[in-house]
């Protein structure tokens, strides 16, 4: 029986409107119907949880109403979006997949995806 | 900083039953998963299983399913575990622990010591 | 259940000396494999997690290594505090424990 794999990309920049968005995909041992993916992010060998959501194989990810995530999935594949990211958020952010039910339970971490943020530069102010 | 403060010793009859505790501080109690792990004097560690404070989801040790129940009180940020139908094999140190957000066990209490014994 | 052993019970060593403590995984575990330190009395405390990254604090003499179902921990310029059983730990699936290796002056 093969270790639960969990691949991301290494680097992400994010958009001009601090949006980043990257696929998180796994290789499951075994047959789950219950999946609980969390994000973190890791800077100066703090982590922290970034946001986290259960969905049953097939449904939708439902993240709370406040996370700044959002997300869908195909399969053993989640395509995570993280949103209102500014400069100070550089960092690398974690892809941690739990295969919740049916026993047993597996754990599989990525080697996490280093999102570079830049703050947009504020407009001139245009005189008419 | 995080610690985990575990009650004190217990000496209990057999058949009898006992609820430890794990009192936790220094970090945001609903965020990380509550292991027990056993310990018998001289021999290794054994995972008796976790739960998850924010929503009270238990997964335990195929072993300990029915000797061991987890509860959390996240008013006192208080892990218990309670050990029923109490033998000989029970006497052991039983630690608490804290889940990392990567996996591993980060931080320990210091242990409980429970001697069954008639 | 993944079993993990620790082939060596007992490790003899002397102050200075680097020394290899082994552990085997029954099955592939990736890189999520911790080792811990514990003292006679004590808890243990954690001091490598994901096979090869040292927790908070950790002196740089303790280093983990392997993947799959071969790992290592070592102590390079053994300390007298260092003295102590050592306990690998897989956290892929359900967490399992080694039996232990005691590290104890030659």
């Known amino acids: 029986c093969k270790a639960m794999h969990v691949a991301q990309p290494a680097v992400v920049l994010a958009s001009s409107r601090g949006i980043a968005s990257f696929v998180c995909e796994y290789a499951s041992p075994g047959k789950a119907t219950e999946v609980r993916v969390t994000v973190l992010r890791q800077a100066d060998s703090q982590v922290t949880e970034v946001c986290a959501a259960t969905y049953m194989m097939g449904n939708e990810l439902t993240f709370l109403d406040d996370s700044i995530c959002t997300g869908t999935s195909s399969g053993n594949q989640v395509n995570l979006t993280i949103q209102g990211l500014r400069a100070m958020d550089t960092g690398l952010y974690i892809c941690k997949v739990e295969l919740m039910y049916p026993p047993p339970y597996y754990l599989g971490i990525g080697n996490g995806t280093q999102i570079y943020v830049i703050d947009p530069e504020p407009c001139p102010d245009s005189d008419f | 900083q995080v610690q985990l403060q575990q009650s004190g010793p217990e000496l209990v009859k057999p058949g009898a039953s006992v609820k430890l505790s794990c009192k936790a501080s220094?970090?945001?109690?609903?965020?990380?998963?509550i292991n027990w792990v056993k310990q018998r004097p001289g021999q290794g560690l054994e995972w008796i299983g976790w739960?998850?404070?924010?929503?009270?989801?238990?997964e335990y040790n195929e072993k300990f399913k029915g000797k061991a129940t987890f509860t959390v009180d996240t008013s006192s940020s208080t892990a218990y575990m309670e050990l029923h139908s109490l033998t000989s094999e029970d006497s052991a140190v039983y630690f608490c622990?804290?889940?990392?957000?990567?996996?591993?066990?980060?931080?320990w209490g210091q242990g409980t010591t429970l001697t069954v014994s008639s | 259940d993944i079993v993990m052993t620790q082939s060596h019970k007992f490790m003899s060593t002397s102050v200075g000396d680097r020394v290899s403590i082994t552990c085997k995984a029954s099955q592939d575990v990736g890189t999520l494999v911790a080792w811990y330190q514990q003292k006679p009395g004590q808890s243990p405390k954690l001091l490598i997690y994901w096979a090869s990254t040292r927790h908070t604090g950790v002196p740089d003499r303790f280093t983990g290594s392997g993947s799959g179902t071969d790992f290592t921990l070592t102590i390079s310029n053994v300390q007298s505090e260092d003295l102590a059983d050592y306990f690998c730990?897989?956290?892929?699936?359900?967490?399992?424990f080694g039996a232990g290796t005691k590290l104890e002056l030659k």
């Open positions: 739960i998850h404070p924010r929503d009270g989801s238990t």
């Open positions: 730990q897989q956290y892929s699936s359900y967490p399992t």
């Open positions: 622990a804290r889940r990392g957000l990567l996996g591993p066990l980060d931080y």
């Open positions: 220094g970090y945001t109690f609903t965020s990380y998963d």
